[in-house]
């Protein structure tokens, strides 16, 4: 039961995380105009990975896409790449994890196959989350660097009286969404990896005992190994018959020995 819950929760958390990564990637507010000494501005600038926008206080908002590819900063391209890789890996991970869910039966899929798929999706979620966190962090670092550079020469004098105020940019909402979403995807991935350990059929332990059993006698799997996985001792031991054949309720998706702590 705990394994199913862990796997299900991991899937849901990862799903929310990946949705957040997609949202962050699409958002326009990666960087927003710093309103350092002017909380009310007639023209408000903000930028995303794909376009920059200007919101005028009268209500008019105009966004322009970055129609150049080669003219963009390498860092921005890197952030785009990291976010896209994160989304792709996350999407594949979600697809794999759907089939790996213990509560979903697809034909006569072995537990070992589900365990492998759970582990694969978990790793994908972890990498996806790391990609998102890395992408957002690289962008944030770029912002901090530019912020202090523009602060250093905020006012550039032009002919004595005339002043040109340089626009400074600070963290936008998308950065926080990205960090949280990346973290959730990472946590979801870790949960899937933990669930995978509980899903593993532990064949070596079965074989070591069950194949030496005689016709009508039964052998019980010791709970020691299970305890070592961190899921607690085996509280519901199942009978294992000659040849390692499964019992009726092991074939069906009734609660198995792995579902209880």
């Amino acid at each position: 039961m705990a394994v199913t819950a862990c796997q299900g929760l991991g899937f849901v958390v990862s799903l929310i995380g990946i949705a957040g990564i997609i949202a962050a990637t699409c958002m326009d507010q990666w960087s927003t105009q710093d309103l350092y000494n002017n909380p009310v501005t007639a023209v408000f600038n903000y930028q995303g990975l794909w376009r920059s926008c200007v919101r005028e206080s009268s209500g008019f908002t105009e966004c322009r896409g970055y129609f150049t590819l080669l003219g963009l900063p390498a860092m921005l391209q890197a952030v785009r790449a990291l976010m896209i890789v994160g989304i792709v890996l996350g999407a594949i991970g979600l697809l794999v994890s759907i089939f790996a869910l213990k509560c979903i039966r697809i034909g006569s899929m072995e537990d070992s196959a589900k365990a492998n798929m759970t582990l694969t999706s978990g790793i994908m979620f972890i990498v996806s989350g790391l990609c998102a966190i890395a992408g957002v962090s690289v962008f944030a670092n770029m912002l901090v660097t530019n912020f202090w550079m523009s602060t250093a020469n905020m006012y550039t004098g032009m002919g004595g009286m005339v002043q040109t105020v340089q626009t400074r940019y600070t963290f936008g909402a998308a950065l926080f969404v990205g960090w949280v979403a990346g973290g959730l995807t990472l946590i979801g991935g870790v949960m899937m990896c933990i669930a995978c350990r509980g899903l593993a059929p532990e064949e070596t332990n079965y074989k070591a005992v069950s194949y030496h059993a005689s016709g009508h006698s039964v052998a019980y799997k010791p709970g020691g190994f299970k305890a070592s996985t961190g899921f607690g001792s085996n509280t519901k031991n199942k009978k294992i018959y000659d040849g390692g054949a499964r019992t009726e309720d092991e074939v069906q998706s009734y609660p198995s020995k792995h579902d209880y702590v």
Epitope: T41, A42, V43, G59
Partner: antibody
Framework: QVQLQESGPGLVKPSETLSLTCTVS?????????WNWIRQPPGKGLEWMGY???????NYNPSLKSRITISRDTSKNQFSLKLSSVTAADTAVYYC???????????WGQGTLVTVSS | DIVMTQSPDSLAVSLGERATINCKSS????????????LAWYQQKPGQPPKLLIY???TRESGVPDRFSGSGSGTDFTLTISSLQAEDVAVYYC?????????FGQGTKVEIK
Amino acid sequence: QVQLQESGPGLVKPSETLSLTCTVSGGSISSNYAWNWIRQPPGKGLEWMGYINYSGNTNYNPSLKSRITISRDTSKNQFSLKLSSVTAADTAVYYCATSYYGNSFIYWGQGTLVTVSS
Amino acid sequence: DIVMTQSPDSLAVSLGERATINCKSSQSLLNSGNQKNYLAWYQQKPGQPPKLLIYWASTRESGVPDRFSGSGSGTDFTLTISSLQAEDVAVYYCQQAYSFPWTFGQGTKVEIK
């Protein structure tokens, strides 16, 4: 096309409060515009007084900030100006205007002359 | 506050001739986010409200004759009437919309010579 019409008393006594209303037709006051008040003393230039925008936020000219209030009534599709403690220097033609792209004033009312005199 | 200074105060031009009005701001009106200058030009005829001619320094408002054009960037702007017509006799104002409070120039009166 949005049309604006100012209304209110043409004569106000010094130290009293000047109250004007702008009625909007051909568009909703809740639409994505800012609704401004601009004044022009006789024979002089234009002065922006303040606005109330689409979300109900106001912004005033600091030179008038302690005396000015702009509000709106969405049910009547109107916005209004209140200017307290008026003096002869507040005698002007008062215009209501709509700003949008470029924060420029795209639609104007015909204006109403308000004289401050005892 | 950004101070807008227009020159000249008045201008007399022959019919069909070019009229040029200048406007200078005390601070740059160029927004780096969209590379647009937040300056507008208005025409005001006696007894009428001002009428928007140009916004974003050079974008002509719909319905405005193409003899009116705006140019300039940063702090120096120009309104040009390429061929003055009798109906162009009016006072012309520039207005900055980049920083609060929004401010107008003192106006330039255009007359026929």
